[in-house]
């Protein structure tokens, strides 16, 4: 019978025993950068070519006996998750294994960064198809190494790291930490959070997806024949690095940026329990699963967009928070959230010739969080627009006036520290969804696209009565780009997407009182692109 | 220590080179930083990761890492180079005491110095 | 879904020899440890012995020490059980059972997590008697 | 060897009861401990490990708690099915002992 994590990555129309996914990763090549391992175990007999590259730091400790089985272990058992024969994700995917890791499962940041650097090199001298490679080691945050990972990412080569067993937040470790690196943590079958021993998978912000990672058997290097289970985010990030490999194979052409967008957007949704994690972390936590896309072809017509949260501001009064989004992608919309309430929103602006997304503290606040809500929409050419708080009494508004331009978000940022306390709720005029509206005293920014067949519409829902949570959602085949809130009342904490759904947040119920400042809506941003559709039915 | 004594033994004590007075202040304006991982343990002392600035050709890291190991020398201090990046991060490796980070921090190019650390399978 | 099923039980006289096996399907069956737990007639449940997944490293309970031999080969997706100087007090149903478990890395060692016995046979039955 | 004791050796309870029964381990295990649930001429079945944890696919119902020495099983509402035979197991080492059962039968 399929392995429970097999089934769990596999797609439901694709779930017969004899499953071969098509291709099977065998156009890219995958680099493991971990301990020795067993090459002619019959999982990977073959399909895995050790190099010469080794740089490990002596074990520690006077009654280390070094065994090579031990030794091992970690790195075969990952290269058989990836491509073996049996248990592997990408059977057909080819493998190169660089020596970082020794005896005790212990490297240095220094060897991996010879190992990146080794990498590099071998790819200018002989350059091959789409590379992978699968960081199965963490370390606490390193500047230089995450620096090294960036360059390579942009080289074009496509890093899946494991997020982490520290049961801690991944952006304090690296490479986990780094932007460009695909972070994965760990569930297990009944697609909880992964604990081991005392601790468990990281989580946070820093994750961008999650894999089964508990109880995976694979290669052991106790036999050529033996298999065993082993259990991390190392085997999570296998997964990944494995279904990487499938969807470069399947599209060699996909950028850095659109595998991360189709991870996302195939992974299963809203399947952890995210009480597992620290309260303050289960917003930041991206709740998806990774799972093969259901076909090799046909995702190039969708509009993906991903959710990219900032680390928090701090709780100074100027403080402020920036997400980026990736180089190939756009900043559709940008939001602002903060737990106590107190903030002063957020606004898009220029840095470095890209927009960034910035959320501003206000006085008293405990910090923000900027959300910024990123896409990859070709041939786009963005701007925003910005209104002046207004003085008349009917608010501030801002629309996209040049011909063929969109709205796909709304931000508004206020200097008054208590804005809305005392203010009605500002109504958003009918018949005129192509603005953005908002209070009289801020400043109104929306975010105006013109794109090829680029259409958008915007969605509300709003609650007369005060609640914790109002949600909307785009409809299928509609891609969520833009998330507000209406009106900026003070006890909106903020708004952010999760998937295909804007939420906003309110201040518990209990404490709010239901008054006329209680109603609260929602308002979506749904896009579609009929460019990308049309082009991807004449490929087909 | 013996281990630590006996890599020590390797180390070849840079001679006094005629480059070493040419040694230029960094651009004005531009401090660089040194950074350490914040987990004690994990740390690694007497290895440094000297990262030199974007533009940095391999050139300009070796003559970087020459100066670093002629000024250490003068000081008394012995410092092992072991290994000069290009291709990804300009920059290099090295073996020195930790006396040396202020020194180091002052040579040209350089953009930050990271002390080396440990990382784990997972 | 993993099968476990135990044959080699019968009855046999005090002193005799008997060999139970437990034939296993899947790549699962080696990927684990597994334990022979046995249950003499109206009494609880009494681990015998385990074997690791390579065969390298087995445990038995002190009343069969040196009696019994625990076995398995990997070829044929089987464990073993080489009962030898057998006793009166050996007449019980003998179970295979899997003991699920699994490996991860902390703090630069190579950890063992165990779940408990998660899949078993229907049992076999060992009567030990003149 | 570690010895386990489980208490009561017998328990008469009802449907809809809320039951729990006890498991002594003569020295620390840390939360190395299992339950399982047996039927008259069955093989037992695994139902929580690790002391707390609840296998796959074992109703909720079913609840594990305890560190170190003292460890329960709980049924917060039992069902028809539920009356059979429980026993602890410790995996402390790799040699593993059985507590000697505890019976619940229909009052």
């Known amino acids: 019978s399929i392995p429970w994590n097999l089934e769990r990555i596999t797609p439901p129309r694709y779930r017969a025993d004899e499953y071969q996914p098509p291709d099977g990763g065998s156009l890219v090549e995958v680099y493991l950068l971990d301990t020795s391992i067993q090459s002619d175990h019959r999982e990977i007999e073959g399909r895995v070519m050790v190099t010469d590259f080794e740089n490990v730091p002596e074990e520690d400790g006077t009654r280390f006996h070094r065994q090579a089985s031990k030794c091992d272990s970690h790195g075969t058992h990952l290269a058989g998750v990836v491509s073996g024969r049996d248990a592997g994700v990408a059977k057909g995917a080819s493998m190169r294994s660089l020596r970082v890791l020794n005896c005790q499962g212990k490297g240095t940041v220094s060897g991996t960064l010879i190992g990146l650097e080794f990498i590099r090199k071998s790819q200018l001298v002989q350059p091959v198809g789409p590379l992978v490679v699968l960081l199965p080691l963490a370390g606490g945050y390193s500047r230089v190494l995450n620096a090294a990972c960036q360059r390579l990412a942009r080289a074009g080569v496509v890093l899946v790291t494991a997020a982490g067993n520290f049961r801690d937040d991944a952006c304090l470790y690296s490479p986990a930490s780094a932007p460009e690196v695909i972070t994965v943590g760990a569930t297990n079958a009944q697609d909880q959070p992964v604990t081991l021993g005392t601790l468990g998978t990281n989580f946070g912000r820093c994750v961008d997806l999650f894999a089964p990672g508990e109880d995976i058997i694979g290669a052991s290097s106790d036999c050529s024949t033996c298999f065993v289970s082993q259990s991390g985010t190392s085997q999570a990030a296998a997964h990944v690095a494995g279904i990487a490999a499938m969807m470069l194979s399947a599209e060699p052409e996909l950028t850095l940026a659109e595998l991360r967008q189709r991870l996302i957007h195939f992974s299963a949704k809203d399947v952890i329990n995210e009480a597992w994690f620290p309260e303050d972390q289960r917003v930041l936590t991206p709740n998806l699963v990774a799972a093969l896309p259901p076909s090799t072809h046909g995702a190039g017509w969708q509009l993906f967009c991903r959710t990219v949260w900032s680390a928090h501001s701090g709780p100074t009064r100027m403080a402020t928070a920036v997400a980026r989004c990736a180089p190939d992608e756009e900043l559709l919309s940008c939001s602002s959230f903060s737990r106590s309430g107190k903030r002063r929103g957020e606004r898009m602006e220029a840095q470095g010739g890209k927009l960034v997304c910035r959320a501003h503290n206000a006085f008293g606040g405990e910090g923000v969080y900027a959300i910024a809500r990123c896409c990859l929409l070709p041939q786009a050419n963005c701007s925003v627009h910005t209104a002046p708080p207004a003085e008349a009494s009917m608010g501030t508004r801002v629309h996209c006036h040049q011909q063929g331009h969109v709205l796909t978000g709304c931000s508004s940022h206020w200097e008054v520290e208590d804005l809305g306390t005392h203010k009605p709720p500002v109504l958003r005029p009918r018949g005129q969804p192509n603005q953005c509206v908002g209070h009289r005293e801020a400043s109104i920014h929306a975010s105006c696209c013109h794109a090829p067949g680029l259409e958008c519409k915007v969605k509300e829902h709003g609650i007369p009565a005060p609640q914790e949570q109002v949600t909307v959602a785009c409809e299928e085949g509609w891609t969520l780009t833009g998330c507000s809130a209406l009106p900026g009342t003070s006890h909106v904490l903020g708004a952010y997407a999760v998937d295909n759904t804007c939420v906003v947040r309110s201040r518990d119920v209990s404490t709010t009182g239901s008054t006329s400042e209680g109603a609260v809506t929602a308002v979506a941003i749904c896009c579609r692109s009929r460019h990308l559709a049309q082009a991807s039915q004449e490929l087909q | 220590q013996e281990d630590e004594d006996g890599d020590y033994e390797e180390l070849v004590l840079a001679l006094r080179s005629e480059e070493d007075g040419l040694a230029e202040a960094p651009e004005h304006g531009t401090t660089a930083t040194f950074h350490r991982c914040a987990k004690d343990p994990w740390r690694l002392p007497g290895t440094y990761v000297v990262v030199l600035k974007e533009e940095t050709h391999l050139s300009q890291s070796e003559r970087t890492a020459r100066r670093l190991q002629a000024q250490a020398a003068r000081r008394g201090y012995l410092t092992k180079i072991l290994h000069v990046f290009h291709g990804l991060l300009p920059g290099f490796l090295v073996k020195m005491s930790g006396d040396l980070l202020e020194l180091a921090l002052k040579l040209p190019h350089v953009d930050y110095i990271e002390e080396d650390s440990s990382v784990f399978a997972q | 879904e993993v099968q476990l099923v135990e044959s080699g039980g019968g009855l046999v006289q005090p002193g005799g020899s008997l060999r139970l096996s437990c034939a296993a399907s899947?790549?699962?069956?080696?990927?684990?440890?597994m334990s022979w737990v046995r249950q003499a007639p109206g009494k609880g449940l009494e681990w015998v012995a385990n074997?690791?997944?390579?065969?390298?490293?087995?445990y038995y309970v002190d009343s069969v020490k040196g009696r019994f031999t625990i076995s398995r080969d990997i070829a044929k997706n089987s464990l073993y059980l080489q009962m030898n100087s057998l006793r009166a007090e050996d007449t019980a149903v003998y179970y295979c059972?899997?003991?699920?478990?699994?490996?991860?890395?902390?703090?630069?060692?190579?950890?063992?997590?165990?779940?408990?016995?998660?899949?078993w046979g229907q049992g076999t039955t060992v009567t030990v008697s003149s | 060897d570690i010895q386990m004791t489980q208490s009561p050796s017998t328990l008469s309870a009802s449907v809809g009861d809320r039951v729990t029964i006890t498991c002594r381990a003569s020295?620390?295990?840390?939360?190395?401990l299992a339950w399982y649930q047996q039927k008259p001429g069955k093989a037992p079945k695994l139902l929580i490990y690790?002391?707390?944890s609840l296998e796959s696919g074992v109703p909720s119902r079913f609840s594990g708690s305890g560190s170190g020495t003292e460890f329960t099983l709980t049924i917060s509402s039992l069902q028809p099915d539920d009356f059979a035979t429980y026993y602890c197991q410790q995996y402390n080492s790799y040699s593993y002992t059985f507590g000697q059962g505890t019976k619940l039968e229909i009052k």
């Open positions: 059972a899997r003991d699920r478990g699994t490996y991860y890395y902390a703090d630069g060692d190579y950890n063992y997590y165990y779940y408990g016995m998660d899949v």
């Open positions: 690790k002391a707390s």
């Open positions: 074997i690791k997944q390579d065969g390298s490293e087995k």
């Open positions: 899947g790549i699962t069956f080696s990927s684990y440890w």
């Open positions: 020295q620390s295990i840390s939360s190395w």
